[in-house]
């Protein structure tokens, strides 16, 4: 019924340690970088490098920062208002239909095809038939890779609809 999501899906509707900064909600919502307190009367700041919120919200906690997997590089760190940005290492890419892991890019095109697009962190090499110029949509060769359940990708609660 629900899939893991980022706070984009939570907007705009978020534990409190005594040292955390507090302010009052505005029209029942707390600003990015904060979540609402259990009694709904305070906004409590997220903990830098640990959790975050990106929108005005009334979530009762901040969202966990994503930890980049091995095989990924961190493009930008997690702040209180923005999640970590991770990218596949050079020579690997993340497919739309399996975003939980980086897959190795193919090293070359099948016989009778030519390469028209390079390996990028978000796409495999692109091959077209020499004659027709149509794209190749064959299976990517299986890559021996262990799929681990990442604490990120993305690190946030499930869809809260229901």
């Amino acid at each position: 019924e629900s899939a893991l999501i980022t706070q984009q899906d939570l907007a705009p509707q978020q534990r409190a340690a005594p040292q955390q900064k507090r302010s009052s909600p505005s029209e029942g919502l707390c600003p990015p970088g904060h979540h609402i307190s259990e009694d709904g009367r305070d906004c409590i700041s997220c903990k830098y490098g640990q959790d975050y919120s990106t929108h005005w919200n009334d979530l009762l906690f901040c969202l966990r920062c994503t930890r980049c997997d091995s095989g990924e590089v961190e493009l930008s760190p997690c702040t209180t208002t923005r999640n970590t940005v991770c990218q596949c290492e050079e020579g690997t890419f993340r497919e739309e239909d399996s975003p939980e892991m980086c897959r190795k890019c193919r090293t070359g095109c099948p016989r009778g095809m030519v390469k028209v697009g390079d390996c990028t962190p978000w796409s495999d090499i692109e091959c077209v038939h020499k004659e027709s110029g149509t794209k190749h949509s064959g299976e990517v060769p299986a890559v021996e890779e262990t799929v681990t359940s990442s604490p990120g990708t993305p690190a946030s609660p499930c869809s809260l609809s229901g």
């Epitope: 019924e1 629900s2 899939a3 509707q13 978020q14 534990r15 009052s24 909600p25 029209e27 029942g28 609402i36 259990e38 009694d39 709904g40 009367r41 919200n57 009334d58 979530l59 009762l60 906690f61 966990r64 609660p157 499930c158 869809s159 809260l160 229901g162």
Partner: antibody, heavy 122, light 112 residues
Framework: QVQLVQSGAEVKKPGASVKVSCKAS????????MNWMRQAPGMGLEWMGR????????FYNQKFKGRVTLTVDKSTSTAYMELSSLRSEDTAVYFC???????????????WGQGTLVTVSS | DIVMTQSPLSLPVTPGEPASISCRSS???????????LHWYLQKPGQSPQLLIY???NRFSGVPDRFSGSGSGTDFTLKISRVEAEDVGVYYC?????????FGPGTKVEIK
Amino acid sequence: QVQLVQSGAEVKKPGASVKVSCKASGYSFIGYFMNWMRQAPGMGLEWMGRFNPYNGDTFYNQKFKGRVTLTVDKSTSTAYMELSSLRSEDTAVYFCGRSAYYFDSGGYFDYWGQGTLVTVSS
Amino acid sequence: DIVMTQSPLSLPVTPGEPASISCRSSQSLVHSNGNTYLHWYLQKPGQSPQLLIYKVSNRFSGVPDRFSGSGSGTDFTLKISRVEAEDVGVYYCSQSTHVPWTFGPGTKVEIK
């Protein structure tokens, strides 16, 4: 469809502990708080506390703090409520109930378990 | 803790006739954000409670429109426009404006 199925009735002696389970199905378990309520014979309902399966946080009614422990097993989408140092007045039906992560919609329970009768008697 | 009181505690009803249950809180349930967190549940015989109305007047999904909620501050009412046999059970009001959340003692609705 959303279902919360609780463990069976228990009979315990005073001073003992009881652990009640609540297995969730039909929704994403880590997407909602799991709350626990109880209803003593001839009495009203009492909210005991809630567990956040997403980050492991707990929030207790002060009345039960120190005696109640809420946990979950995410792998089986099961929530647990353990009540220790039982006394006769803890004899009640214990319910689990789901609520939203938002303050504005988090204070009511849209789905409930069927209840578990816990009897404390010497 | 906020004390919730309900009246009457027992309500004999005639099918097809209206019914009304009152709920009072020991303090105002208006939150500093302007919303009022007063909810109604029905516990049918041998069942667990089920949500009827949330935040004073919002019917939960699948709840017939013969049920309606109203009120403000400390005084709230649940009305059933035309009682049906399946409406018997114990009705509870509940508040989540103040921690800890508390319930009323319940009103038992039974057919005359």
